[in-house]
Interface confidence: low
């Protein structure tokens, strides 16, 4: 028996809802009395959903997880997993028997856009020329790990004295605190771009320093 | 063979810091979830940190601010930075492998443990 | 956090016997329970995960049962190296992960 599903992973954003599709081609005179069907992490073979003797057997997995119970006679036995989490990332195994049997591993990349980076100075006055300053770049609630870049106004990439460090809070999105020292010039832009590697999504953050006042786009 | 091993361990006052190691071999640290349990002298077994193969971290609430736990992917090391410690933290420190990535699961490879004091 | 409890705290047994210990979770954990076995001045063992499966190597004398709230590790035919304390882990809610407080196995 066929089991078909996606080559390339779902990605799914955080919180909300996923479907992993898996499909078989029934037999004419295919009864759903006939079908077992099983969803399990493939890792551990932990149960996540499952039908059997013409039954909808429910959700094994803190309830989130539901066929698509009119569409399992045409073959459709596609998982939907809902208020996805970061912890939900991996792979899952579609199980489907009737006489014959088949299974294929579908993955799920959990995704969480980055938030607006926010910037801060230190110090943030009286500065002058030839001063080493400290700006910080800090965007959150975003998943997974993200990549950070810093340039100046001329988009010159600033790779030396940054450092980067990602914290995870309870529900696994990261907080990202990026942190470039410079040595002022007379006046300078400097950009950082805090990058979603998964959804390819860029947050933009900048401070201008133009002498006496600073700006914060 | 996968096998975990700890070190760090010893005796500390109230308030000081120490930082405990776990040597990982038979596998790669950052394709799995790894964990730190602990275990009070007679007493049962308590979930204390862990961090999946992607990085992210977990803490007890009981520890939460206080204990930082890392790794060093280039030694396949697991780290427990303990800081304030306090009399309740002395327990024997167990490193604990989660047959997955991401750790929210059973621990399928222990290490011996590591005994950590803390004591006036 | 969940919550589980584990009865009875010590069980008093003869090698041959059965020995049945209870996991009651606070609330639902469905299936996504572990049993481990330790002995004195040993780490922890995996014997059980998903509340039925049996780890390597795992004899097939234990054996689990149960779900939501209602967890069961039985031990048939209680052999000499199988006298030690017995932890039940939950991982469905968290974090944090918890683990019951024991249920100490010892010969009569």
């Known amino acids: 028996l066929e089991v078909q599903v996606p080559e390339d992973p779902v990605v799914a954003l955080v919180g909300t809802d996923a479907t992993l599709c898996c499909s078989f081609s029934p037999e004419p005179g295919f009864s759903l009395a006939q079908l077992n069907l099983i969803w399990q992490l493939t890792d551990t073979k932990q149960l996540v959903h499952s039908f059997a003797e013409g039954q909808d057997q429910g959700s094994a997995y803190a309830n989130r997880t539901a066929l698509f119970p009119d569409l399992l006679a045409q073959g459709n036995a596609s998982l939907r997993l809902q208020r996805v989490r970061v912890a939900d990332e991996g792979s899952f195994t579609c199980f489907v028997s009737i006489r014959d049997f088949g299974s294929a591993a579908v993955s799920l990349q959990v995704a969480a856009p980055y938030s607006k980076p926010s910037m801060t100075l230190e110090p943030n006055k009286d500065l002058r020329p030839g001063d080493t300053v400290t700006i910080t770049c800090s965007s959150y609630r975003g998943y997974p790990e993200a990549e950070v870049f810093w340039q100046d106004g001329q988009g010159v990439p600033l790779t030396g004295n940054v450092t980067t460090s990602q914290m995870a809070n309870e529900q696994g999105l990261f907080d990202v605190h990026s942190v470039l020292r410079v040595v002022l010039g007379a006046n300078g832009t400097y950009s950082c771009l805090v990058r979603n590697p998964v959804l390819q999504q860029d947050a933009h953050g900048s401070v201008t320093i133009t002498g006496q006042p600073m700006t914060f786009p | 063979d996968v096998q975990l091993v700890e070190s760090g361990g010893g005796v500390v006052r109230p308030g000081e810091s120490l930082t405990l190691s776990c040597a990982a071999s038979g596998f790669t640290i950052n394709s799995y979830a790894v964990s730190w349990v602990r275990q009070a002298p007679g007493e049962g077994l308590e979930w204390v940190s862990g961090i999946s193969g992607s990085g992210v971290r977990y803490y007890a609430d009981s520890v939460k601010g206080r204990f930082t736990i890392s790794r060093d992917d280039s030694n396949n090391t697991l780290y427990l930075q303990m800081n304030s410690l306090r009399a309740e933290d002395t327990a024997v420190y167990y490193c604990?492998?989660?047959?997955?990535?991401?750790?929210?699961?059973?621990?399928?490879?222990w290490g011996l443990g590591t005994l950590v004091t803390v004591s006036s | 956090e969940v919550v589980l409890t584990q009865s009875p705290g010590t069980l008093t047994l003869s090698p041959g016997e059965r020995a049945t210990l209870s996991c009651r979770a606070s609330r639902s954990i469905l299936t996504s329970l572990a049993w481990y076995q330790q002995k004195p001045g040993q780490a922890p063992r995996l014997l059980i995960y998903?509340?039925?499966t049996r780890a390597t190597g795992i004899p097939a004398r234990f054996s689990g049962s149960g779900s939501g709230t209602e967890f069961t590790l039985t031990i048939n035919s209680l052999q000499s190296e199988d006298f030690a304390v017995y932890y039940c882990q939950q991982y469905y809610d968290w974090p944090p992960l918890t683990f019951g407080g024991g249920t100490k196995v010892e010969i009569k």
């Open positions: 604990a492998r989660s047959n997955k990535v991401t750790w929210n699961n059973f621990f399928d490879y």
């Open positions: 998903n509340t039925v």
